[in-house]
Amino acid sequence: PEPPTACREKQYLINSQCCSLCQPGQKLVSDCTEFTETECLPCGESEFLDTWNRETHCHQHKYCDPNLGLRVQQKGTSETDTICTCEEGWHCTSEACESCVLHRSCSPGFGVKQIATGVSDTICEPCPVGFFSNVSSAFEKCHPWTSCETKDLVVQQAGTNKTDVVCGPQDRLRA
């Protein structure tokens, strides 16, 4: 571990003296002196500072721009930033969630492995043998082929990854 520095935790060194840092939610107005304590002021409306600090300006809360498909997930406080998320059907383009894009749909032959959230896109997977998807969808999984046998029917047309099997009546001429 690093050896301890001249000033303690939640202090900073300035002009040969240790001054108290300002607590989260407050900004520095003036450093301490030999005779006075550090002077701090609360951040204003729509501002925040989330650490013990010596910042002279608070940070502005993030703006969730509806024109970019964003909405407020969690309102900011003097100690926390606003958290944005995307409108229904959309997801963030980055971890910082600065803009949104429409959820991707899975093409025919692919099914939804994981439904999209506000922060992650749809994950598609190819339909394996025995399953199909005949629609472009952001919700539909691959469906299993119909089991003709359980309906006392026979396969008339084989299924693919995009189509279901076609069942038909048993050939009655067969012994």
Epitope: P3, T5, A6, C7, L13, I14, N15, S16
Partner: antibody, heavy 116, light 107 residues
Amino acid sequence: QVQLVQSGAEVKKPGSSVKVSCKASGYAFSDYLIEWVRQAPGQGLEWMGVINPGSGGSNYNEKIKDRVTLTADKSTSTAYMELSSLRSEDTAVYYCARGGGGFTYWGQGTLVTVSS
Amino acid sequence: DIQLTQSPSSLSASVGDRVTITCRASQDISNYLNWYQQKPGKTIKLLLNFASRLHSGVPSRFSGSGSGTDFTFTISSLQPEDIATYYCQQGSTLPWTFGGGTKVEIK
């Protein structure tokens, strides 16, 4: 009144170590940082490091941090500066000073001569 | 490291003259600048801290101004006892650094 009294002059051989003391009086020793500064003959002032006598925590000048150790004894209100692996260019007057908005009070200085 | 450039390096003035020394920092140091006086064979003294605050017991003929990167130290009326070397020092960012010094002499 605030006073910082340093130990006497030293003559040292290259490669050896020196320990300079700085006894403080006239104020609460633990409440102020102690700074160390040196001045080579005919040269300007060079900051060496700072110690918090209350916590024992310190910061050093990167140029000499591997060779300098600052300590403080609260029971005697004395700060110490030890410099090891001495070389001829360490010949200087070594000063301690009290912090608190600049180096507010200075010791009288300790001449350390490094010579073979 | 923050460099402090002090000028002039030496000056000669008459008793009663106004003497001005400048100190320029290589980057913004706000008002964390201190001025010291070093007389031969005497303890170094703090004259001004935070660029312009007179330290206790220092005569009012000494003054300072400036903020950011440019600072000025003034002796309004030079006295014989002011013969000394004067240093600026920044307390903004470690490592603390000093100017090269200005030697003041009497004509």
